[in-house]
Amino acid sequence: FPQDRPFEDTCHGNPSHYYDKAVRRCCYRCPMGLFPTQQCPQRPTDCRKQCEPDYYLDEADRCTACVTCSRDDLVEKTPCAWNSSRVCECRPGMFCSTSAVNSCARCFFHSVCPAGMIVKFPGTAQKNTVCEPASPGVSPACASPENCKEPSSGTIPQAKPTPVSPATSSASTMPVRGGTRLAQEAASKLTRAPDSPSSVGRPSSDPGLSPTQPCPEGSGDCRKQCEPDYYLDEAGRCTACVSCSRDDLVEKTPCAWNSSRTCECRPGMICATSATNSCARCVPYPICAAETVTKPQDMAEKDTTFEAPPLGTQPDCNPTPENGEAPASTSPTQSLLVDSQASKTLPIPTSAPVALSSTGK
């Protein structure tokens, strides 16, 4: 809002600055297309380029795509920020055997300590489990007695970590998701006791559910493994991630093992009706960038009329029909009224069907 500026003389005559009453000082006005990196920029270096969603400004001042964590064995560690990439790491119960820039090319399941061995250091996203020989009694290294129990007879000790990415995958190549699942199924068969119950080959009771992974004794990391493009919801069900395949949508966050993909309207559009994790109806943003100044009155709360530039004069504006009517093909819920000196209706076309599920924020 235009502020009361008791000290505006300090910025007077300098169009490159404005007065910020919150911090009570003159601030540098970032040029068009650049955005401040702090509340009250002081110099041009306090302004930066604005990248598209899912891009960040790298050290060379280039907009660079953030890595995605959409592979089933990865989770997001830090989000995509304006000046840093998203960082992915192996999901709980796994560690990274081949690292990649801001991510991991190959994740393996943590090893299970074989008979006669106990966990010295639990596995992390970066390191495999470290085992040590079991001493008589309970070792202090055991978080609980369960962690120190020897595997039941008949169990095949897991001497090597189990890969879930194809061995051919590299830092620059994302493994094929189908192949990943096959590798997981194979690993699941290999590391499960021959006479133990197995879900491999059985119909899944849950859509999108693939076989559960072997559970290291005493580990809390046993959970369902959902199919690609499904996630494990809060109720423990495999649920389909929303799709952003509509023309007017772009992916905001990827489908992860424990959260849905989220979609948003593409740049230049605004969400008129939301849907869970997405937008049911996107419309072109109806207000053009203002080129004119408000009439002298102080934007009174009643019946004030405003000068506005003619619609269609901005590159990202939809021209309004001369008669002010929306085209016959435009449904009533797809138009917004522009109220300037002459009220006109601005048609808002959309490629989206209006009757989409919209059951939450």
Epitope: D20, C263, E264, C271, C279, I287, V293, V338, D339, K361
Partner: nanobody, 122 residues
Framework: EVQLVESGGGLVQPGGSLRLSCAAS????????MAWYRQAPGKGCELVSI???????YYTDSVKGRFTISRDNSKNTVYLQMNSLRAEDTAVYYC????????????????WGQGTTVTVSS
């Protein structure tokens, strides 16, 4: 940090009026476009109206002729005057700053303020 506080909601009979206010803080220099959104029970977040920084206003068809959005820059406040209220206007109303940038996803309800509840019932 931008903070918004919505107020003015309440219980009103069909045909009645209410005036919602959205008090803003944390903006520097000229404020951005502002939008009112609403969320009815069990429904999605729906765009109601937008006011530009220079006072141009936009309304969805379901409220045009009944609702009026305005802003008082000296008070850093945006208003939504709601007349001829209908049962279908029952919702929690939220204001959102800079909808061009902030409201591309379906999450413009409740991100900045707690909202104010409007109930239209006889």
């Amino acid at each position: 940090e931008v903070q918004l506080v919505e107020s003015g909601g309440g219980l009103v009979q069909p045909g009645g009026s209410l005036r919602l206010s959205c008090a803003a803080s944390g903006f520097t220099d000229d404020g951005p476009d502002m939008a009112w959104y609403r969320q009815a029970p069990g429904k999605g977040c729906e765009l109601v109206s937008i006011i530009s920084a220079d006072g141009r206003t936009y309304y969805t068809d379901s409220v045009k002729g009944r609702f009026t959005i305005s802003r008082d820059n000296s008070k850093n406040t945006v208003y939504l005057q709601m007349n001829s209220l209908r049962a279908e206007d029952t919702a929690v109303y939220y204001c959102a700053p800079d909808p061009r940038r902030n409201c591309r996803g379906g999450d413009c309800c409740g991100n900045w303020g707690q909202g104010t509840t409007v109930t239209v019932s006889s």
